[in-house]
């Protein structure tokens, strides 16, 4: 089974870790897939490591564990994150997560010019 | 849709390297989902796989050839190259690119050809 | 490595006919890594089934793919002119590395 958060929030312009955990008695993980809606964010394969598409290869690193952190979030990236956790045997089981960017709580509070 | 054109000389001297490009059009190289490999082919003989690459200039290598084959990219110009080292008469083959879709899992192929080019080893 | 044994190495068929070609393993491949292609004189390969059994664009219902552990089986049903040529299977595995068989020729008879 898949568990995850299913609701997570952060600010702009800060980070936040997506992670999905699978766990299962017999069944190994050969690959973990994550994506935005359906943009490919990053690859996990067992055989040949992490692969982060290069459209947020400046934003996305991998880790920690088979997660990711996202950074420099924008509110842009308010959705829907989907892991997707290839297994053998076993099949593929999915995780869904929510993410939510609030605006700065620094612009939130910024006193506007005297005159 | 996505095309791949291999281009190169067709006559290497032996013990010389042998230098390939393939241009990728109709796609990004940079596509995440797909490596990108070579493949060659001995006349009259099966098929080979060299080695693969990814955009970010992952690799992995045919441990047969690894001592001898270089895979790099150039994602500016939506090309992948190899180079083949210290070749023989043994190395005279037809070449292919190919997208490979090993992070695909469920549907691990090569699923796009160009169409090859010959290279011959000779003096 | 894996090594991929095909056989017969030439199979001799008229028109109508069914084609059955073998590829064995010499070690279990998942059946998700096993493809199956066809290669016409002077072309490039052409890839007909990924996974050991699903079709890639294109291919007609006639080819299909089936198997599991280290027996793989590519059936033709009724062989059209276009069809006769030479069919590889090849492994998709990272290590040991991936391999290809060393193909079936389809003639005709």
């Known amino acids: 089974t898949i568990d995850t958060k299913r609701n997570i929030s952060a600010e702009e312009g800060g980070s936040v870790i997506l992670q999905c955990h699978f766990s299962s008695d017999t069944a190994e993980v050969t690959q973990v897939d994550w994506k935005q809606q359906d943009q490919l964010l990053a690859i996990y394969s067992v055989d040949l490591g992490w692969h982060v598409a290069s459209v947020f290869s400046d934003r996305v690193v991998p880790g920690p564990s088979l997660g990711l952190t996202f950074q420099s979030l924008t509110m842009n990236d308010t959705g829907e994150y989907f892991c997707t956790y290839h297994t053998y045997p076993g099949g593929i089981y999915k995780g869904r997560i929510f993410l939510k960017v609030q605006e700065s709580s620094v612009a939130q509070f910024q006193t506007a010019p005297l005159g | 849709q996505v095309q791949l054109q291999e281009s190169g000389p067709g006559l290497v001297k032996p013990s010389q390297t042998l230098s390939l490009t393939c241009t990728v059009s109709?796609?990004?190289?940079?596509?995440?989902?797909?490596?990108w490999g070579w493949i060659r082919q001995p006349p009259g003989k099966g098929l080979e796989w060299i080695g693969s690459i990814y955009y970010s200039g992952s690799t992995y290598y045919n441990p047969s050839l690894k001592s001898r084959a270089t895979i790099s990219v150039d994602t500016s110009k939506n090309q992948f190259s190899l180079k083949l080292s210290s070749v023989t008469a043994a190395d005279t083959a037809v070449y292919y690119c190919?997208?490979?879709?090993?992070?695909?899992?469920?549907?691990?192929?090569?699923?796009?050809w160009g169409q090859g080019t010959m290279v011959t080893v000779s003096s | 490595e894996i090594v991929l044994t095909q056989s017969p190495g030439t199979l001799s068929l008229s028109p109508g006919e069914r084609a059955t070609l073998s590829c064995r393993a010499s070690?279990?491949?998942?059946?998700?890594?096993l493809a199956w292609y066809q290669q016409k004189p002077g072309q490039a390969p052409r890839l007909l089934i990924y996974?050991?059994?699903s079709r890639a664009t294109g291919i007609p219902d006639r080819f299909s793919g089936s198997g599991s552990g280290t027996d793989f089986t590519l059936t033709i049903s009724r062989l059209e002119p276009e069809d006769f040529a030479v069919y590889y299977c090849?492994?998709?595995?990272?290590?040991?590395?991936?391999?290809f068989g060393g193909g079936t020729k389809v003639e005709i008879k």
């Open positions: 190919a997208r490979d879709g090993v992070l695909a899992l469920n549907k691990r192929s090569f699923d796009i």
């Open positions: 070690q279990s491949v998942s059946s998700s890594y």
């Open positions: 996974g050991a059994s």
């Open positions: 090849q492994q998709h595995t990272v290590r040991p590395p991936l391999t």
């Open positions: 109709g796609g990004s190289i940079e596509s995440g989902l797909y490596y």
